[in-house]
């Protein structure tokens, strides 16, 4: 395939990535699947500049990102290293809280209304952000 030259319609470009901001809510797994079907992934926040960009676009609304610990350690969906990477948790978070009464803890990360991160029950219907890299080879065949 060829490299994408620009972002798809209704996606926003920033620093060689394309972003799509939902206006409805889905559970984390459904949001993750939605992005994959778009040949993208839930947003992976790798820097303070990217954090500010996403925060500006989503506003003060709970929004899923591509970070979870459903299999133990925290992992970014694209394989970016969590331990050495950018983090912006709220104080005392993540806390894997069990007190919500919904069963289990909290295994999925989201932007809170102030932009900092929290872990929450993955079934909550939050908005989400998809991201894809412009430098990634697209699935479309090259033009002859």
């Amino acid at each position: 395939g060829s490299e994408r030259a620009c972002c798809p319609v209704n996606w926003v470009e920033h620093e060689r990535s394309c972003y799509w901001f939902s206006r409805s809510g889905k559970a984390w797994a459904d949001a993750d699947n939605y992005c994959r079907l778009e040949d993208a992934h839930l947003v992976v926040v790798t820097s303070w500049e990217e954090q500010k960009f996403v925060q500006h676009h989503i506003g003060p609304v709970n929004t899923w990102m591509g970070l979870h610990d459903q299999n133990g350690p925290w992992k970014w969906v694209d394989g970016t290293d969590y331990e050495t990477g950018f983090k912006n948790w709220r104080p005392e978070q993540p806390d894997d809280w069990y007190g919500h009464g919904l069963g289990g803890g909290e295994d999925c990360a989201h932007f809170t209304d102030d932009g900092r991160w929290n872990d929450d029950v993955c079934q909550r219907p939050y908005r989400w952000v998809c991201e894809t890299e412009l430098d990634k080879a697209s699935q479309e065949p090259p033009l002859l």
Epitope: S47, W48, E49, D113, D114, R116
Partner: antibody, heavy 117, light 107 residues
Framework: QVQLVQSGAEVKKPGASVKVSCQAS????????MHWVRQAPGQGLEWMGW????????NYAQKFQGRVTMTRDTSISTAYMELRRLRSDDTAVYHC??????????WGQGTLVTVSS | DIQMTQSPSSVSASVGDRVTITCRAS??????LAWYQQKPGKAPKLLIY???SLQSGVPSRFSGSGSGTDFTLTISSLQPEDFATYYC?????????FGPGTKVDIK
């Protein structure tokens, strides 16, 4: 033009607290995070944390967690940094600095805090 | 935490000299690096942001380059007002960290 004007020098005893102010002008105060950076005499620069004046969110360097509080008063476009349980090694010049693109683009003139018994 | 190192720690130079200062991050920070100039008793002044972008009002003799872990600040022709201490700073992730500084003084 953008200006950050800080409060005057302070002398404090060990164990006391200090509150430094930083008044912003020349831009929309709630539109930019404000950072605090300190510099001990003859030493380098040390980031302490930030406050988002728009929603009062904060992020503190782990070294200062539990001892520092950053606040703001949007009505007078002023950010504050309070440091508690002062020690002699907290003697430093404390600067506020506006968040820019991967940088601190404007700085306050600095406030010297001297901790001495 | 990301550690920042600078070299040299000091350099003696003359007016008109080309001066190069290097900064290295302990892990990749892409292009999220800034350079500052500080004179005694004054606040730091932003020179370069995003590794190579010149801050408004800063003379064009200052330039920055690099990406990932290795970065450079170059002063193409040193002027009398450039004698100062220069710091790099990573703004990729918290805690933001600074290099130890490079003092440029008169030879």
């Amino acid at each position: 033009q953008v200006q950050l004007v800080q409060s005057g020098a302070e002398v404090k005893k060990p164990g006391a607290s200090v509150k430094v102010s930083c008044q912003a002008s020349g831009y929309t105060f709630t539109g930019y995070h404000m950072h605090w950076v300190r510099q001990a005499p003859g030493q380098g620069l040390e980031w302490m944390g930030w406050i988002n004046p728009n929603n009062n969110a904060t992020n503190y360097a782990q070294k200062f967690q539990g001892r520092v509080t950053m606040t703001r008063d949007t009505s007078i476009s002023t950010a504050y940094m309070e440091l508690r349980r002062l020690r002699s090694d907290d003697t430093a010049v404390y600067h506020c600095a506006r968040d820019g693109t991967s940088s601190f683009d404007y700085w306050g003139q600095g406030t010297l805090v001297t901790v001495s018994s | 935490d990301i550690q920042m190192t600078q070299s040299p720690s000091s350099v003696s130079a003359s007016v008109g000299d080309r001066v190069t200062i290097t900064c290295r991050a302990s892990q990749g920070i892409r292009k999220w690096l800034a350079w500052y100039q500080q004179k005694p008793g004054k606040a730091p002044k932003l020179l370069i942001y995003a590794a190579s972008s010149l801050q408004s009002g800063v003379p064009s003799r200052f330039s920055g380059s690099g990406s990932g872990t290795d970065f450079t600040l170059t002063i193409s022709s040193l002027q009398p007002e450039d004698f100062a201490t220069y710091y790099c700073q990573q703004a990729n992730s918290f805690p933001f960290t600074f290099g130890p500084g490079t003092k440029v003084d008169i030879k």
